[in-house]
């Protein structure tokens, strides 16, 4: 059986696959997924290994029309480095010489300057090029190699291994060499895989059942450390509760060097955030941190300094802490917008069982603003999801120059932010450089400001506008209002009407359904339309909603189904990557972010059309 990293190299023109007959003969044969000799896999960013021989594809020289055969894998050899060129060409790195079928006289696969159909290769059974099944470095744990990546294949006691092994062990623990010759270099680490006993790599907090892995002997950059945690279905550490910090202070007390945690300010337009999307509500900075020096965007926990946090350059090499298991957040169920009949008094705006109102003109200090909201039967607003924030920005009449009190504050316990309405903190969205909590002026209250409505801590005594929120009163069955310019069941936003397509459909089916409604799969022109759509679909239980974006027409170039320029994107992390496909919006914790899916997957969708009676604004000229 093929494991997910292995593939057959297929030439569509001949309908045949590459076959490693022997190390000196790499030819083609009728494709057979059970033949070991036809299985290959990437073993570094640029090397392809034959699974049968545990040797790498290479050439004797970078010249036209030489045979491609198998060599002992050598990550430094220029003659074993391959790269995908445009579309389905595979070439030797840095040259216009391609992996080629050969010809009638030449049965062997050859290196050739021609880029025609005989030089075009796909993964058998797919339409993808060979790089779509690319190499993913596997970071080791413990051992003696400072967390370096596995080197496949590696030699141990004169035998080659292309995977983690338990050779030399009687307990089944899986390990790998971190250089190609363990026998000479003696460098190794344990693999971040599940095996009997691997749970002893983790410390479980008996109070919360959350597990932590302290990798104090590793030396990785922040991004590498994060990848290592993710390879174990975990994330870099987030700390949202005082108890959690206390537990980790104890766990790391015998250590001295800094350890990466998930806190970072890598997002271009927002502030400090946890990589696992936990809310940043508890602060434990080392005095003098976070320093405002550019580039110091990642955070380490300092065991030698009472486990306090310090921001550093992300390329520094440190140990790290991973976290997995039940989140430390209280379970707090936010009702989906469609589940709650929402009736609000005049001048209040309904959303997901609550009513909201901006008080912009009567500026008040935080304490007085809170009193006013409570007199009106509510509280300063709490915000629990990106959808709720996007509702406030896109539909409450929020303005880019607003600075408005919300209910978040750390008045009760310093450096521990809570909502004034007592609801749990499940979400935060800080402005770049925030929360700054400047010591020379007590910044215990929080405002929403700027075009995106992100947050900043502020001295509570400033007179500002504020946002109130209260529970709505249910009044029997909800009356479906027909919005002006839109048909029944459609929702209006600015000049457009939107409708959720409730049938699970492929991208093509969804597009057709929208067309049948004299509409099209939604385009997303800017941050504000994105905010509206996030609040429109983000709380729904389905995972994805199709948009009109895809690279069906030209691989690698994403276009809307209607002739409109792509002027705004909102990709999820690691997207769009190299995957061709169609774009859907995520819901839930990654609400609104765009993922590339296979176009024949089934999802719900959003249709869009011009509202009636709206004058089309002129198209922007470029």
């Amino acid at each position: 059986l093929l494991d997910t990293r292995q593939f057959l190299i297929y030439n569509e023109d001949h309908k045949r696959c590459v076959d490693a007959v022997s190390p000196s003969a790499v030819q083609t044969a009728a494709c057979n997924q059970d033949a070991e000799s036809q299985k290959f896999r990437w073993v570094s960013e640029s090397q392809i290994m034959s699974v049968a021989f545990k040797l790498c594809l290479g050439v004797p020289s970078k010249t036209d029309w030489v045979a491609i055969t198998l060599y002992a894998c050598d990550s430094k050899s220029e003659f074993q480095k391959w790269e995908c060129k445009n579309d389905t060409l595979l070439g030797i790195k840095g040259e216009d010489l391609f992996f080629n079928y050969g010809n009638r006289q030449e049965k062997n696969i050859m290196l050739y300057k021609g880029s025609g159909l005989w030089s075009r290769w796909k993964i058998y059974g797919t339409t993808d090029n060979l790089c779509s099944r690319g190499y993913e470095a596997m970071y080791t744990l413990l051992g003696n190699a400072n967390g370096a990546t596995c080197a496949f294949p590696f030699k141990f006691e004169n035998k080659w291994y292309a995977d983690c092994t338990s050779a030399g062990r009687s307990d089944g623990w899986l390990w790998c060499g971190t250089t190609t010759d363990y026998d000479t270099d003696k460098l190794f680490g344990y693999c971040p895989l599940k095996f009997e006993g691997s749970e002893s790599l983790w410390n479980k907090d008996p109070l919360t059942s959350v597990s932590y892995q302290i990798n104090s002997k590793s030396a990785l950059t922040w991004h590498q450390a994060r990848k290592s945690c993710q390879q174990q279905n975990a994330e870099l550490l987030s700390i949202t509760e005082i108890h959690e910090q206390t537990y980790l202070t104890g766990l790391t007390s015998s250590l001295t060097s800094g350890l990466w945690i998930g806190l970072n300010s890598l997002s271009f337009n927002s502030g400090w955030q946890w990589s696992d999307r936990s809310p940043f509500r508890y602060l434990n900075w080392l005095p003098g941190s976070p320093s405002a020096e550019p580039g110091k965007s990642c955070v380490s926990l300092n065991p030698g300094k009472n486990a306090k946090w310090e921001n550093l350059e992300c390329v520094q090499k440190l140990g790290y802490i991973c976290k997995k298991g039940n989140t430390t957040l209280n379970s707090f169920v936010i009702p989906s917008e469609s589940d709650v009949p929402t009736h609000c008094p005049s001048q209040w705006w309904p959303y997901a069982g609550h009513c909201y109102k901006i008080h912009r003109d009567e500026k008040k200090i935080q304490r007085d603003a809170l009193t006013t909201c409570r007199k009106e039967g509510g509280d300063l607003t709490s915000i629990h999801t990106i959808e709720e924030l996007d509702f406030i920005i896109s539909q409450l009449g929020y303005e880019p120059n607003d600075e408005l009190w919300i209910g978040l504050n750390d008045i009760k316990i310093q450096m521990y932010f809570e909502w004034s309405d007592g609801t749990p903190v499940t979400f935060t969205k800080w402005l770049r450089g925030e929360p700054s909590h400047e010591n020379n002026r007590q910044e215990d209250c929080v405002v929403m400001k700027g075009k995106d409505g992100y947050w900043a801590d502020r001295g509570c005594e400033w007179p500002l506008g504020y946002i109130c929120k209260m529970k709505s009163r249910s009044q029997g069955p909800e009356i479906v209002e027909v919005e002006k310019g839109c048909r029944k069941g459609w929702k209006k936003h600015h000049f457009y009407c939107y409708m959720i397509g409730h049938t699970l459909s492929t991208f093509a089916e969804a597009n057709q359904t929208c067309n049948n409604e004299n509409a099209y799969l939604t385009t997303i022109e800017d941050r504000y339309e994105q905010a509206f759509l996030t609040s429109f679909v983000g709380l729904r239980p389905e995972k994805y909603f199709w948009t009109g974006l895809s690279d069906i027409q030209t691989k690698g170039t994403f276009q809307w189904t209607i002739e409109e320029e792509v002027r705004f994107t909102h990709w999820n992390s690691d997207m769009p990557g190299r995957k061709p496909g169609c774009v859907a919006m995520r819901t839930g914790i990654a609400g609104g972010l765009w993922d590339v899916l296979k176009c024949d997957e089934k999802a719900k969708f959003v249709c869009k059309h011009w509202a009636e009676g709206v004058t089309h604004p002129p198209k922007p000229t470029t």
Epitope: L142, N144, F156, G168, R169, S170, D171, W175, F188, S200
Partner: nanobody, 119 residues
């Protein structure tokens, strides 16, 4: 690297008792199992008792009910309490630790301690 030191062997009369201990030291991350073996003169080495990191135990049929294996995780030490000893228990007793350490090899052996059961 990893060192194992056994102690507690000696001469004992039949039906008497002895307590063997085996202490592991060195660069050990965790000990997944500790096992006692014995080898009588002219015979093959045989497993006597084993204990895992989680505390599960296993005994050879010939010692069940007479021998008890236990461990002290904090001290990286395993004990073998031997009661109702018989002359056929005479052997060199070896301790093996299955460890996670700074080499990929897992099995480390002690030098052995001699137990003689004789009147």
């Amino acid at each position: 690297d990893v060192q194992l030191v056994e102690s507690g062997g000696g001469l004992v009369q039949p039906v008497g008792s002895l307590r063997l201990s085996c202490a592991a030291s060195g660069s050990i991350f965790t000990i997944n199992a500790m096992v006692w073996y014995r080898q009588a003169p002219g015979k093959k080495r045989e497993e006597v008792a084993a204990i895992t990191r989680g505390g599960s135990t296993n005994y050879a049929d010939s010692v069940k009910g007479r021998f008890t294996i236990s461990r002290d995780n904090a001290k990286n030490t395993v004990y073998l309490q031997m009661n109702s000893l018989k002359p056929e228990d005479t052997a060199v007793y070896y301790c093996k630790a299955v460890v996670v350490t700074t080499t990929p090899y897992s099995d480390y052996w002690g030098q052995g301690t001699l137990v003689t059961v004789s009147s």
